[in-house]
């Protein structure tokens, strides 16, 4: 088996505090998924990350950091159009049981006002495995830069699995990608949240197989309406 890069897949530790909106969804003490803080009460993640109860880690790039905030959450709202068969509309809002305390290390993500075009450089982050198929989970938040790929080019790889609210990102001939455990985490482009990690080819990091993300710019109305409805 070809050796993989030793971060996210082929990434590096994020600059400390550079992703203050990044959260981890834990099941007990174990990483389940990534997510992003939308405001003091709400986290946005992938619908396929649904559990009955969550522990949300905020405010530190290091899992297990005692200075981090840990907040329980027991209510979550999947997009009503989410399908376990087609993976379309793979997003979900998680309502925190108590408010997050905003600080230099805990900030709200900027939701997009527009969809960024193919070719845009973006950063994906998470605590997901840094090796594949065998797993190695880091304690520090990892980042990798990828570029948005046009739906036409991505369809050449994934054919009819690709739906129009999915977004692809990667680097040609590179292993740079997200992997298991990064699900629900952010793809940030020019300071706004453009994607949530959804799926990709396994083992991770196969050159020319882009990562697939939920295209957040298509769902801002649903996000805002859902938070308002369940205030």
């Amino acid at each position: 088996e070809e050796a993989q890069g030793d971060k996210i897949i082929d990434g590096a530790p994020c600059a400390r505090g550079s992703h203050p909106w990044q959260v981890a969804l834990l099941s007990g003490n174990q990483l389940h998924c990534g997510g992003v803080l939308v405001n003091e009460r709400w986290v946005l993640t992938a619908a396929h990350c649904k559990m009955n109860e969550y522990t949300v880690h905020l405010g530190s790039d290091t899992l297990g950091d005692r200075r981090a905030q840990r907040i329980k959450a027991s209510k979550s709202f999947r997009h009503p159009g989410y399908s376990t068969q087609t993976h379309v509309n793979d997003l979900m809002l998680v309502k925190l049981n108590s408010q997050a305390r905003l600080s230099s290390m805990v900030k709200k993500v900027r939701l997009p006002s527009r969809c960024e075009p193919p070719g845009t450089t973006c950063t994906v982050s998470g605590w997901g495995t840094t090796t594949s198929p065998d797993v190695t989970f880091p304690s520090d938040l990892m980042c990798v830069d990828v570029k948005l790929i046009s739906p036409q080019d991505c369809t050449k790889v994934y054919k009819d699995l690709l739906e129009n609210s999915m977004l692809c990102a990667g680097i040609p001939d590179s292993k740079k990608n997200a992997c298991n455990g990064d699900s629900g985490g952010p793809l940030v482009c020019r300071g706004t949240l453009q994607g949530l990690v959804s799926w990709g080819t396994f083992p991770c990091g196969q050159p020319n197989d882009p990562g697939v993300y939920t295209q957040v710019c298509k769902f801002t109305k649903w996000i805002n309406d859902t938070m308002k409805k369940h205030r």
């Epitope: 396929h48 559990m51 068969q85 797993v135 699995l161 699900s183 991770c204 697939v212």
Partner: antibody
Framework: QLQLQESGPGLVKPSETLSLTCTVS??????????WVWIRQPPGKGLEWIGS???????YYNPSLKSRVTISVDTSKNQFSLKLSSVTAADTAVYYC????????????????????WGKGTTVTVSS | DIQMTQSPSTLSASVGDRVTITCRAS??????LAWYQQKPGKAPKLLIY???SLESGVPSRFSGSGSGTEFTLTISSLQPDDFATYYC??????????FGGGTKVEIK
């Protein structure tokens, strides 16, 4: 290396519930995005997929058996289990557990998988 | 459900023969096909996945080909250890996974 071992009663009475457990050793059942799978083979016949589970607890069942099947996972014991209710003689088979290797991870990890590691199988006879 | 039809159901051959087994899907499954070998009283063993990828540790005399609806498993030079039953499995639809009826390769 990874090994799977089925266990459970070899004889079940008609109308009762068949219960089997698969113990995974040499690796963690929590290693997403693998699928943990049950397959059966009636005497002298071919293979039939029963269903599968992810470590998160998401389950996928054969529609022909869905109303009678429950698959569950216990990550703390590194085990997953099969329950098949209201059994008849037609459920007499060798039952195998296996690991399913997916083509995709994340939202698509329950989808498009083949089995690379199998248990030895356990024979279950349904008879009064 | 996608039906998988294997042919022949039984095949008589000698050591050293080139053996070909065919599997047809009732609808296109792209390259999502696996081949397994099963010996009496034993669990199936993975030989080929994604139609043509050889599983680690499987002898190179085994090869797979095909895409869409028609697939073949070829054993280039049959060895004594290869007398067994072979199954194809489609994993190209979300549910259920389905297997072919099996091909028994027996000594001529």
């Amino acid at each position: 290396q990874l090994q799977l071992q089925e266990s459970g009663p070899g004889l079940v009475k008609p109308s009762e519930t068949l219960s089997l457990t698969c113990t995974v050793s040499g690796g963690s059942i929590s290693s997403s995005p693998y699928n943990w799978v049950w397959i059966r083979q009636p005497p002298g016949k071919g293979l039939e997929w029963i269903g599968s589970i992810l470590h998160s607890g998401s389950t996928y069942y054969n529609p022909s058996l869905k109303s009678r099947v429950t698959i569950s996972v216990d990550t703390s014991k590194n085990q997953f289990s099969l329950k098949l209710s209201s059994v008849t003689a037609a459920d007499t088979a060798v039952y195998y557990c296996a690991r399913g290797v997916p083509t995709y991870w994340g939202a698509a990890s329950h989808y498009y998988y083949y089995m690379d590691v199998w248990g030895k199988g356990t024979t279950v006879t349904v008879s009064s | 459900d996608i039906q998988m039809t294997q042919s022949p159901s039984t095949l008589s051959a000698s050591v050293g023969d080139r053996v070909t087994i065919t599997c047809r899907a009732s609808q296109s499954i792209s390259s999502w096909l696996a081949w397994y070998q099963q010996k009496p009283g034993k669990a199936p063993k993975l030989l080929i996945y994604k139609a043509s990828s050889l599983e680690s540790g499987v002898p190179s005399r085994f090869s797979g080909s095909g895409s869409g609806t028609e697939f073949t498993l070829t054993i280039s030079s049959l060895q004594p250890d290869d007398f067994a039953t072979y199954y194809c499995e489609q994993y190209g639809s979300e549910s259920p996974l389905t297997f072919g009826g099996g091909t028994k390769v027996e000594i001529k």
